[in-house]
Interface confidence: low
């Protein structure tokens, strides 16, 4: 397959509600009409698929209903949001982009975004 450059931020800090957002940008060599975006998590040399979506250019990304990911696309940029994160989910999140159609097929894998998740401190009991 043909290689394609994918850029993503090096570091992102998740919000106190366990939500992290980052942009995945790819250098499209041609006029793709169908794009597949996959988010992979690398931790302790293990790589697991977090979520994936295939979308038609100009349309919204549609992840599975039970997916922890949502996203929007604009040109060659995909704005990804991962929710429900906890401290144990801290790790390197890699954006993989495939230009599926029309041929030729292109594959690009980003260097990864290190997402740091800090569980919120429990609220102290208050005496009212």
């Amino acid at each position: 397959c043909k290689a394609m450059h994918v850029a993503q931020p090096a570091v992102v800090l998740a919000s106190s509600r366990g939500i992290a957002s980052f942009v995945c940008e790819y250098a499209s060599p041609g006029k793709a009409t169908e794009v597949r975006v996959t988010v992979l998590r690398q931790a302790d040399s293990q790589v697991t698929e977090v979520c994936a979506a295939t979308y038609m250019m100009g349309n919204e990304l549609t992840f599975l209903d039970d997916s922890i990911c949502t996203g929007t696309s604009s040109g060659n940029q995909v704005n990804l949001t991962i929710q429900g994160l906890r401290a144990m989910d801290t790790g390197l999140y890699i954006c993989k982009v495939e230009l599926m159609y029309p041929p030729p097929y292109y594959l690009g894998i980003g260097n990864g975004t290190q997402i740091y998740v800090i569980d919120p401190e429990p609220c102290p009991d208050s005496d009212f």
Epitope: K2, N59, Y105
Partner: antibody, heavy 124, light 107 residues
């Protein structure tokens, strides 16, 4: 088991429009994993790709036929259609509809399911 | 358009023979090549995709190889049901183009 069935008139007059429909059964035409295509084969000759369509309506045509070809899809009927305008004797061929599958990881596409084909003769 | 040239255009062989059909692309198509078998009055049948991957249900005597511009379909030991016409197809870029076909006949 997926099945594709072409239907339409077997005889078309020169300068008229050839219209064929492919009905898909045993699977949904709306699957995001597949495209749907038309291929033709003049008697005793080789195969020629005409064009492909995605369920959303995105189309891809052979430039040699583009000015005369329209491919459309009707997801409610699980069908896709071919129209070829201003036909001539050279358009006489067996017309096949087929599913275009994608093999994840290799970037490979292929026609894996075909209709049995329908012969269309262009003659007055 | 990418031109696909098959050779030979026809071939006579006997049951049990090893047969090789070649397909040459006018420019590099990586491994974006498929092989089809067609029998008279029937639709083509997919044999090989991605230049060398055997389609499910296809006998292992069929194999494909090659990359770039030169590709080969090999039938290791011809069976009576293998006498047919074989086509290569490139899908590296639009328009998809087929080779002109190789007719395999009984000697």
């Amino acid at each position: 088991q997926l099945q594709l069935q072409e239907s339409g008139p077997g005889l078309v007059k020169p300068s008229e429009t050839l219209s064929l429909t492919c009905t898909v059964s045993g699977g949904s035409i709306s699957s995001s994993s597949y495209y749907w295509g038309w291929i033709r084969q003049p008697p005793g000759k080789g195969l020629e790709w005409i064009g492909s369509i995605y369920y959303s309506g995105s189309t891809y045509y052979n430039p040699s036929l583009k000015s005369r070809v329209t491919i459309s899809v009707d997801t409610s009927k699980n069908q896709f259609s071919l129209e070829l305008s201003s036909v001539a004797a050279a358009d006489t061929a067996v017309y096949y509809c087929a599913r275009v599958s994608y093999y994840y990881g290799s970037g490979s596409y292929y026609f894996d399911y075909w209709g049995q084909g329908t012969l269309v003769t262009v003659s007055s | 358009d990418i031109q696909m040239t098959q050779s030979p255009s026809s071939l006579s062989a006997s049951v049990g023979d090893r047969v090789t059909i070649t397909c040459r692309a006018s420019q590099s198509i990586s491994s974006y090549l498929n092989w089809y078998q067609q029998k008279p009055g029937k639709a083509p049948k997919l044999l090989i995709y991605a230049a060398s991957s055997l389609q499910s249900g296809v006998p292992s005597r069929f194999s494909g190889s090659g990359s770039g511009t030169d590709f080969t379909l090999t039938i290791s030991s011809l069976q009576p049901e293998d006498f047919a016409t074989y086509y290569c197809l490139q899908h590296n870029s639009y328009p998809y183009t087929f080779g002109q076909g190789t007719k395999l006949e009984i000697k």
